[in-house]
Amino acid sequence: PEEPQLRMKNNEEAEDYDDDLTDSEMDVVRFDDDNSPSFIQIRSVAKKHPKTWVHYIAAEEEDWDYAPLVLAPDDRSYKSQYLNNGPQRIGRKYKKVRFMAYTDETFKTREAIQHESGILGPLLYGEVGDTLLIIFKNQASRPYNIYPHGITDVRPLYSRRLPKGVKHLKDFPILPGEIFKYKWTVTVEDGPTKSDPRCLTRYYSSFVNMERDLASGLIGPLLICYKESVDQRGNQIMSDKRNVILFSVFDENRSWYLTENIQRFLPNPAGVQLEDPEFQASNIMHSINGYVFDSLQLSVCLHEVAYWYILSIGAQTDFLSVFFSGYTFKHKMVYEDTLTLFPFSGETVFMSMENPGLWILGCHNSDFRNRGMTALLKVSSCDKNTGDYYEDSYEDISAYLLSKNNAIEPR
């Protein structure tokens, strides 16, 4: 059955919502990435008008394996400290919480998940003038929310009013089982300047208790682009492939689920020494997209133009120097071989994938590399004939979301 809907009549505050979304110049698109090919044969056509992108996103708990591709390491290896389960080690699997995309408001059918996205939530994006309707359901066991870093106009969907006693939507928790509908509008101030790349790399997270919510896994990528940078499907024009990379130190000691992870994964939970520095160190996971020790293996087609949206978010407090072995990339109009990322920031770079082979993606900080912050990048020929080109993907927003009198009823 559908989620029950709240119906509204004669409400005096929805003009801003009505006016925004029934504008004849605004197209409405429900983003669905299920069928997106990995490359295109024809360059995308830019869209002319602002769009409203509708996303159904849930916070969901699950067991996360940081190293699904790594065999049990030798006990003397560096990896073993992080990956082996034992009396004082949780190992590679931890209960975490993730942002998951769904196809509609029933929150029954998940959107397809790409392995390389890892722990990241769905890729959200919009151009200046676009609106993102975020239908968020908290399917976890504790309060969380979803809030963008990089969009300033964020409000509840049907009016600007916040509940009495709430100063800012960023701090407002959505409780277990609850659905909350947000409206994010991308303003000129949010968008790139002339000296920026076409799309800025930003993120969204839960901000109820940002440090702990983030340590627990709630993070996703957000691209903010200037007008006519993305096509009808949201793919950046002049790019064949978009890749999101999150360099993140997940401090599982700060996760909301630490106690539960100890209870579930340690053979003798009562015997664990929580203050033991080695135990604490074993719970600090130096990851790329939530994977450690080359468990993230990216594939890119030879000769593709690839945009890379790279984030540094997590417990790391210093800058990261990121490299792609075998490659230089263009960053702010300059070719570079190392990208400097400051904490809680993102950068956009692109490169032409001209060197076939298996390459390393990592950071110059050897301490982080030794602790697992490396991934593999495979560049090889692709059969272009198997790809289908992008077509416009429109779907009228459901009548219950957009009807002029705001009557919201089950379909």
């Epitope: 809907q5 409780l175 089982g177 609850e178 909350f180």
Partner: antibody, heavy 117, light 105 residues
Framework: QVQLQESGPGLVKPSETLSLTCTVS????????WSWIRQPPGKGLEWIGY???????NYNPSLKSRVTMSVDTSKNQFSLKLGSVTAADTAVYYC???????????WGQGTTVTVSS | EIVLTQSPGTLSLSPGERATLSCRAS???????LAWYQQKPGQAPRVVIY???NRATGIPDRFSGSGSGTEFTLTISRLDPEDFAVYYC??????FGQGTRLEIK
């Protein structure tokens, strides 16, 4: 001082839809979360659902396929519709104001609904 | 869905005695969202404790709440005749426990 008053038919036939309205006086319906709770005869409290006018809602999973909540800000009223009722839906129905879902601080006096043919 | 289990089902005590009511959650609950209600026959419930340990307006100081995680307690230090009623705990503004009936012995 805030007051809540439930109203609606006291008798509903099986398979029909139960409709109740809660009229709020002394407060703006736009500023709070609002809840419906019921209590079958001789039993405990059962949460039905709550909503916030600007875009928040949460419903008891065991009831949500039958529940519709609506709000009319011009009348400062909110309503509950419960479809396909059976005798098990016989109860005292309460509306209540929720302080940010921390707790229910103001309750209506309750209205008894009997489902019977 | 988090299930709240209250114990005992019925508590028989005399005025002046101390009452201890328990509420156990099937999963950890943020204590900000744990409330206790009192209901007397023929009346609507009223909140006595919110945020696990904060007394609601007009509630006498003999009522206190404590606990965190999965274990919460409502304590009435010296029972007054008017305290005999049914008490419910509630989490996250939604589900209630099944109730504890506090009756005069």
């Amino acid at each position: 001082q805030v007051q809540l008053q439930e109203s609606g038919p006291g008798l509903v036939k099986p398979s029909e839809t139960l409709s109740l309205t809660c009229t709020v006086s002394g407060d703006s319906i736009s500023d709070y979360y609002w809840s419906w709770i019921r209590q079958p005869p001789g039993k405990g409290l059962e949460w039905i659902g709550y909503f916030f006018y600007s875009g928040g809602s949460n419903y008891n999973p065991s009831l949500k396929s039958r529940v519709t909540m609506s709000v009319d800000t011009s009348k400062n009223q909110f309503s509950l519709k419960l479809g396909s009722v059976t005798a098990a839906d016989t109860a005292v129905y309460y509306c209540a104001r929720s302080q940010l879902r921390y707790y229910l601080d103001v309750w209506g006096q309750g209205t008894t609904v009997t489902v019977s043919s | 869905e988090i299930v709240l289990t209250q114990s005992p089902g019925t508590l028989s005590l005399s005025p002046g005695e101390r009452a201890t009511l328990s509420c156990r959650a099937s999963q950890s609950v943020d204590s900000n969202y744990l409330a206790w209600y009192q209901q007397k026959p023929g009346q609507a419930p009223r909140v006595v404790i919110y945020g696990a340990s904060n007394r609601a307006t007009g509630i006498p100081d003999r009522f206190s709440g404590s606990g965190s995680g999965t274990e919460f307690t409502l304590t009435i230090s010296r029972l007054d005749p008017e305290d005999f009623a049914v008490y419910y705990c509630q989490q996250y503004g939604s589900f209630f426990g099944q109730g504890t009936r506090l009756e005069i012995k």
